[in-house]
Interface confidence: low
Amino acid sequence: ACDTATCVTHRLAGLLSRSGGVVKNNFVPTNVGSKAF
């Protein structure tokens, strides 16, 4: 299972995003996309 900080947030958010992760369904910028350095 995905266990990075990114993915933990993704599981809480529960919505697919085009960045390959998931995003919260609101307008507040949050760190929930596919982590990139």
């Epitope: 995905c2 900080a5 390959g20 910028p29 949050t30 760190n31 996309g33 596919s34 350095f37």
Partner: antibody
């Protein structure tokens, strides 16, 4: 203008300590996840440590090779990131880059510093 | 630890040609893959994140594809400034890992 400026590198003997700093400007530092990534001379990239944003409780994660020896921290009031490196080994010799990352959902921001060289040698 | 294997190690092409770089993960990483370009003496530069999303300001000739374990970076028509080392990375599991790099050189 966005800037990440690393400092604190230099020559240190095996077993010694160094504290790297990364000064950020031009963006809202406290919102960003920050990583240290290193590159040994002539080698590839290696992730070292990560500290999450203030809103994510500044949680930290480390590569196994540095766990227990390195400590990542941040001072959001000073827009600064730190890497305390103890018990240094020859294999820690590398250019150390700081990287800032923020995700808006539909886009991301990703910034790199130019790096600071750490040489561990007797 | 998830191992990323890039191929080829070196790719010799001419400007105007198409470049295809591969990155294979030892375990499934869904789409948690990014691609970076690095030139000598410079910091890495993010090109692609989320396997297929171009980062801000990255030219359209760069594209990424793949999911699961197999990923590809394609440069549709090489420009002189594209000759560099390219790395993939994964952020599906700690520790975050990078591939060993592909050197794209002028033929």
């Amino acid at each position: 203008e966005v800037q990440l400026v690393e400092s604190g590198g230099g020559l240190v003997q095996p077993g010694g300590s160094l504290r790297l700093s990364c000064a950020a400007s031009g963006f809202t530092f406290s919102n960003y996840w920050i990583s240290w990534v290193r590159q040994a001379p002539g080698k590839g990239l290696e992730w070292v440590a990560e500290i999450r944003s203030e809103s994510d409780a500044s949680a930290t994660h480390y590569a196994e090779a540095v766990k227990g020896r390195f400590t990542i921290s941040r001072d959001n009031a000073k827009n600064s990131l730190y890497l305390q490196m103890n018990s240094l080994r020859a294999e820690d010799t590398a250019v150390y880059y700081c990287n800032a990352y923020f995700d808006y959902g539909l886009a991301i921001q990703n910034y790199w510093g130019q790096g600071t060289l750490v040489t561990v040698s007797s | 630890e998830i191992v990323l294997t890039q191929s080829p190690a070196t790719l010799s092409l001419s400007p105007g040609e198409r470049a295809t770089l591969s990155c294979k993960a030892s375990k499934r990483v869904t789409t948690y893959v990014s691609w970076y370009q690095q030139k000598p003496g410079q910091a890495p530069r993010l090109l692609i994140y989320g396997a297929s999303n171009r980062y801000l300001g990255i030219p359209a000739r760069f594209s990424g594809s793949g999911s699961g374990t197999d990923f590809t970076l394609t440069i549709s028509s090489l420009e002189p400034e594209d000759f560099a080392v390219y790395y993939c990375s994964q952020s599906y599991n700690y520790p975050y890992t990078f591939g060993q790099g592909t050197k794209l050189e002028i033929k």
